[in-house]
């Protein structure tokens, strides 16, 4: 159906509330430095304009594209040049170049301070005083910190946030009610952001085919009763949705996501037996529920994979007649039979299968050549299995903090050129894989761990791309999406690294360390560990363990002292001197 006015179409489809929320998110993701009030004003103006176009589609400017309307609105911001520098040059361009220019200026690491919640009473007062403004502020603060956040999912989280306050602001002990609920939501939001950033990177750096392959594997595991045609349909629609959101087309993305949810619910008989509960919910919850739905049971009588993909005499003919469909079918069949494998592993197996067919179908006797192809998968399967086993054992021995430190040492030695805050952030997140996955049953560990690692390593790649300092990091990040994790795992100590000059300032601590929350205390200690390694990259694990032990004791001692600052300034230099001597 052709619409005279695209903006009216989206306003009608999405409804005023969701429309306004998505516009606010879009502007906050593009202009990350602007104050909340400016964005509220812009979003209000765009929503009023859309409402007018919905009432009269042939009104002035209603026929303009969304990019034109949004871009024109962004370019009216007076402080554009002061706040964003060369981003203001985007406004000299015409669409679609102008939008591409805005996208290129999105900052994955804007460096805003972490969100600190005011007192519960103040929060509840703000919530009750103006709910819409309160939730708008939430959308704004998340969106500007996470410029690739999946917008329709952010609307869902805002709804959850609203629910938490509606409940807890009535509670006798507001703080006790809010604390754990807000923290649990925060964890979900951070993971959601990282997952979508990975999807956007897949699309932007490796193209539709990579994203589709990833989605075929994931959805085939989740919906093993669906046939390949059904999986292909959902994957094609899902790819469009994520391309739109990653490209800043948030209204189209949210609208198409709602359409996909509708399609899945109308066709649940041919997709999965697990969708029923999701399909009774309103649109935001429905889409979220479908995205998180549990895996369906495997059909009982699946034939052996070998019949179609090895033993069939016409494998090469079938492959050559429609390569992508044949490989897609292979990936689908393999994935639905192996819910315990990570998506990354399944994609490596499909890649190996493709390489084998490319090689064998060019020989005189293809069947003999590819006869053992499924057996040749064993080392590819063993590698992540062994990695997960070894690292979970280490995690169980050391606990989360100790495991993070082991990873900090490991990754600093692999890529010492990478900035200390990035190494600390990424290693802390890599360490969380233990907490998240190692307690799971054996059948879920690999899938949980490796796919989570892919998401975290993507964060490293995204941050490193902004300021590239290590050729080996660039190589691991850009050569192959599915081999990123094995590439990083395979990196040894960087022998070319020239140790950093010693800087006493880096190892100077103050009494304010004592009042920090535990997590921030850990970050300070881990920052010191990385700096120590950059200064002494040849330090052994034993030496590091000793120095870190001494450091912990020093912090504990000075934080218990009467004159904390005096203790830090007196004992600190002694500790540094002892550490330097120990690491000679």
């Amino acid at each position: 159906e052709a619409y005279k006015s695209e903006i009216a179409h989206r306003y009608n489809d999405l409804g005023e509330e969701h429309f306004r929320g998505l516009v606010l998110v879009a502007f906050s993701q593009y202009l990350q430095q602007c104050p909340f009030e400016d964005h509220v004003k812009l979003a209000k103006e765009v929503t009023e304009f859309a409402k007018a176009c919905a009432a009269e589609e042939s009104g002035a400017n209603c026929d303009k594209s969304l990019h034109t309307l949004f871009g024109d609105k962004l370019c009216t911001v007076a402080s554009l040049r002061d706040k964003y520098g060369d981003m203001a040059d985007c406004c000299e361009k015409q669409e679609p170049d102008r939008n591409e220019c805005f996208l290129a200026h999105k900052d994955d690491n804007p460096g805003f301070p972490p969100l600190v919640a005011p007192e519960p009473d103040a929060l509840c007062a703000a919530f009750q005083d103006n709910e819409q403004l309160f939730l708008g502020k939430y959308l704004y603060e998340i969106a500007r910190r996470h410029p690739y956040f999946y917008a329709p999912e952010l609307l869902y989280y805002a709804q959850q946030y609203k629910g938490v306050f509606a409940e807890c602001c009535q509670a006798a002990d507001k703080a006790a009610c809010l604390g754990p609920k807000i923290e649990a939501l925060r964890e979900k939001v951070l993971l959601s952001s990282a997952k979508e950033r990975f999807k956007c990177a897949s699309l932007q750096k490796f193209g539709d085919r990579a994203f589709k392959a990833w989605s075929v594997a994931r959805l085939s595991q989740r919906f093993p009763k669906a046939d390949f045609a059904e999986i292909s349909k959902v994957v094609t629609d899902l790819t469009k949705v994520h391309k739109e959101c990653c490209h800043g087309d948030l209204l189209e993305c949210a609208d198409d996501r709602a359409d996909l949810a509708k399609y899945m619910c109308e066709n649940q008989d041919s997709i999965s037996t697990k969708l029923k509960e999701c399909c009774d919910k309103p649109v935001l919850e429905k889409s979220q529920c479908l995205a998180e739905v549990e895996r369906d049971e495997l059909p009982g009588d699946l034939p052996s994979l070998a019949a179609d993909f090895v033993e069939d005499k016409e494998v090469c003919k079938n492959y050559q007649e429609a390569k992508d469909v044949f490989l897609g079918t292979f990936l689908y069949e393999y994935a639905r039979r192996h819910p315990e494998y990570s998506v990354s592993l399944l994609l490596r197996l499909a890649k190996e299968y493709e390489a084998t067919l490319e090689k064998c179908c060019a020989t005189d006797d293809p069947p003999t050549c590819y006869a053992k192809v499924l057996d040749e998968f064993k080392p590819l399967v063993d590698e992540p299995q062994n990695l997960v086993k070894t690292n979970c054992e280490l995690f169980e021995k050391l606990g989360e903090y100790g495991f993070q430190n082991a990873l900090l040492v490991r990754y600093t030695k692999k890529a010492p050129q990478v900035s200390t805050p990035t190494l600390v952030e990424v290693s802390r997140k890599l360490g969380k894989v233990g907490t998240k996955c190692c307690k799971k049953p054996e059948s879920e560990r690999m899938s949980c761990a490796e796919d989570f690692l892919s998401v975290v390593l993507n964060r490293l790649c995204v941050l490193h791309e902004k300021t590239p300092v290590s050729e080996r990091v660039t190589k691991c990040c850009s050569e192959s999406l599915v081999n990123r994790r094995p590439c990083f795992s395979g990196l040894e100590v960087d022998e070319t690294y020239v140790p950093k000059e010693f800087n006493a300032e880096t190892f100077t601590f103050h009494a304010d360390l004592c009042t920090l929350p535990e997590a921030e205390k850990q970050v300070k200690k881990q920052t010191a560990l990385v700096e120590l390694l950059k200064h002494k990259p040849k330090a052994t694990d034993e030496q590091l363990k000793t120095v870190m032990g001494d450091f912990g004791a020093f912090v504990e001692k000075c934080c218990a002292a009467e004159n904390k600052e005096g203790c830090f300034s007196e004992e600190g230099p002694k500790l540094v001197a002892a550490a330097q001597a120990a690491l000679v």
């Epitope: 046939d227 390949f228 045609a229 059904e230 292909s232 349909k233 959902v234 094609t236 066709n267 008989d269 041919s270 059909p299 179609d308 016409e314 079938n318 007649e321 429609a322 469909v325 044949f326 079918t329």
Partner: nanobody, 118 residues
Framework: EVQLLESGGGLVQPGGSLRLSCTAS????????MGWVRQAPGKGLEWVSW????????YYADSVKGRFTISRDNSKNTLYLQMNSLRAEDTAVYYC???????????WGQGTLVTVSS
């Protein structure tokens, strides 16, 4: 190249039956969802029925539910449509279609005409 050859159409009285067949070649039949699409005089294309590659799941348009039965024989690369209790409104050209993705088809045959009239 992909070929789909329908047969079995013809003139039949209301309430009568017909069995359409479609022989496929040029692609791996057992890997694809297959279906029947029809076009009544002066109307658009309409999915009548489809069947999964392994035959375990079938779909029927509401207008033919309970009267038509789709089946396939992967060893013979053949698709069937058993049509019972035929009505005048079933008059159409019936096309056998290969589907690589739900809701779409990339190849279809020449079609076979089914006329239901007394």
């Amino acid at each position: 190249e992909v070929q789909l050859l329908e047969s079995g159409g013809g003139l039949v009285q209301p309430g009568g039956s017909l069995r359409l067949s479609c022989t496929a070649s040029g692609f791996t039949f057992r890997h694809y969802r297959m279906g029947w699409v029809r076009q009544a005089p002066g109307k658009g294309l309409e999915w009548v029925s489809w069947i999964r590659p392994d035959g375990t799941f079938t779909y029927y348009a509401d207008s033919v539910k309970g009267r038509f039965t789709i089946s396939r024989d992967n060893s013979k690369n053949t698709l069937y449509l058993q049509m019972n209790s035929l009505r005048a409104e079933d008059t159409a050209v019936y096309y056998c279609a290969k589907s690589y993705m739900a809701g779409t088809f990339d190849y279809w045959g020449q079609g076979t005409l089914v006329t239901v009239s007394s």
